[in-house]
């Protein structure tokens, strides 16, 4: 059908209430184009009827509510005036019962899910809510141990709870909840957070922390693209650069030619006392000769590698 | 490939019944709202009833009410709407539709004495 | 339940000419409306969804625009295949309605 195959991250979900996912994929997303979503590689799109369950809404698909079955693979096809583009998202479901059990047992949890506070200082913890703007969301209401929150050191500001003085009594199992409202009804969205405490100052010293990748193989089929973010965290005030190397060589520099393999953009996001960027490598089309050789991701002294591989052949199809 | 076939149509009195049914496949037909769209002849398209995907709501127009329900049996991918007391001006084309892209080709059901 | 008031009912034209099609709301849809094209004897056909996103196969020169009460339908330039009627719809509500149709005519 003349669509390239792009290979994105799994995202781990939390069953019976509202998730959205938007399809971005600058700077495909930036022009004119057309982005439609299928589920498990269905002929026919997801609903466009703002009442379904599943719909999509531009460039988003919206779960109202997650259910546990709807697990899968889900495909959005973004159509420009001469190119087509199909994004690959892995979504798992799981049933959380937040106040059941801890969330620190869950497997791959993102970063949103993992917060730091220092001790001693004044800090904040963030709620993460990504919706189309059909969504409302009410006012944030935190949770610590199933208790709400309550007491002079907390701020409910927007988005973030703001902690002060932190203490060690802080480290926890957090939670933040917001009403949502679409087409006249509304949902709970509970997101939990495991809360530690660090006692350094600024966020893991001046020593950059690669979140992602972590020295770890990617399987991947010859011919399709593929794109790997790499997720550093770093002081608000630091001067590091952050890129992706191969044969101790700029990517950039290094494919100056053919442009094959790129860098994207960084883009970051800002919080009290740190902040998390991002740089993503994208392969427009994986080679043989890719596969084994250590790409790099470099944040200042810091390094973590992706190796490509080739997926074990599947001997169920024959 | 997608296909909507709609069945049960014909010729009923006033004050009769009638079920319509839509079968359906190509697609995960519990994964979709699905309505019934009516068009009498010479006229524009008025909607009937909707409902969601799991059966779980069920939506009428206002000229139906009370007399029509439409409901889905998703083991056998199939819509239903079931019609009492058929009055002349339910004379018309009654069409199964699936989201908003796809239509069956339409059952008639004249009401008639 | 939202009203849907399509205008003109009947449009006389040229092949290659730009025809615009207006549809309003009785009150705000924010962008929840779809066009259909409907020929003789055939069930509709969606052109646009989301007040402006073109439908699967669909020519460009088809394009909608507005939002909350007030949209339109435009063919850019008029080809022989494009008489027939043209229908909005909005679905913010599942009390869907319907426009009562406009009927695109060779001059």
């Known amino acids: 059908d003349g669509c390239k195959d792009i290979f994105m991250k799994n995202e781990i979900l939390s069953a019976s209430q509202p998730f959205a996912f938007n399809c971005t994929f600058p700077p495909i997303t930036s022009g004119e184009v057309s982005v439609t979503w299928y589920k498990n590689s269905s002929k026919i799109p997801v609903s466009k009827i703002i009442q379904s369950r599943i719909h999509q809404d531009e460039t988003w698909i919206l779960f109202l509510p997650m259910e546990w079955g709807d697990s899968g693979v889900y495909q959005c096809v973004i159509k420009g005036r001469d190119s087509c583009h199909r994004i690959h998202v892995n979504l798992t479901v799981f049933e959380k019962h937040w106040c059941d059990t801890s969330i620190g047992g869950l497997p791959n949890l993102s970063d949103e899910y993992k917060q730091i506070l220092h001790l001693g200082k004044d800090d904040s913890l963030t709620c993460h809510l990504h919706f189309p703007k059909s969504c409302v969301l009410g006012p944030i209401k935190w949770y610590k141990d199933c208790n709400e929150i309550k007491g002079e050191r907390f701020t409910v500001l927007e988005t973030r709870l703001l902690v002060s003085n932190v203490s060690a009594e802080d480290r926890g199992n957090y939670a933040c909840q917001a009403i949502l409202t679409h087409s006249g009804k509304q949902y709970e969205v509970l997101n939990g957070i495991t809360v530690s405490i660090t006692e350094r100052a600024g966020y893991g010293g001046s020593v950059p922390k690669i979140i992602y990748p972590k020295n770890h193989s990617i399987e991947v089929q010859l011919g399709t693209t593929l794109i790997v973010d790499c997720n550093v965290t770093d002081t608000k005030d630091n001067t590091n650069l952050r890129c992706w190397r191969v044969n101790n060589t700029l990517v950039d520099d290094y494919y100056d030619e053919s442009k094959r393999i790129r860098e994207g953009v960084e883009t970051h996001v800002s919080f009290r006392e740190h902040n998390l960027y991002t740089v993503n490598i994208t392969f427009l089309e994986v080679k043989m000769e890719d596969y084994g050789l250590p790409f790099m991701c470099h944040a200042g002294v810091s390094t973590a590698y992706i190796i490509l591989q080739l997926p074990a052949p599947d001997f169920r199809a024959y | 490939e997608v296909q909507l076939v709609e069945s049960g149509g014909g010729l009923v009195q006033p004050g009769g019944s009638l079920r319509l049914s839509c079968a359906a496949s190509g697609f995960t037909f519990s994964d979709y709202a699905m309505s019934w769209v009516r068009q009498a002849p010479g006229k524009g398209l008025e909607w009937v009833s909707g409902?969601?995907?799991?059966?779980?709501?069920?939506y009428y127009g206002d000229f139906v009410k009370g007399r029509f329900t439409i409901s889905r049996d998703n083991s056998k991918n199939t819509l239903y709407l079931q019609m009492n007391s058929l009055r002349g001006e339910d004379t018309a084309a009654y069409f199964c539709?699936?989201?908003?892209?796809?239509w069956g080709q339409g059952t008639l059901v004249t009401v008639s004495s | 339940d939202i009203q849907m008031t399509q205008s003109p009912s009947t449009l006389s034209a040229s092949e290659g000419d730009r025809v615009t099609i207006t549809c309003r709301a009785s009150?705000?849809?924010?962008?929840?409306l779809a066009w259909y094209q409907q020929k003789p004897g055939k069930a509709p056909r969606l052109l646009i969804y989301k007040a402006s996103i073109l439908g699967d196969g669909v020519p460009s020169r088809f394009s909608g625009s507005g939002s909350g009460t007030e949209f339109t339908l435009t063919i850019s330039s008029l080809q022989p295949d494009d008489f027939a009627t043209y229908y909005c719809?909005?679905?913010?509500?599942?009390?869907?309605?319907f426009g009562q149709g406009t009927k695109v005519e060779i001059k």
């Open positions: 719809h909005q679905y913010n509500s599942y009390l869907w309605t």
């Open positions: 409902i969601s995907g799991n059966g779980g709501d069920t």
């Open positions: 539709v699936i989201d908003l892209d796809y």
């Open positions: 009150q705000s849809i924010s962008s929840w």
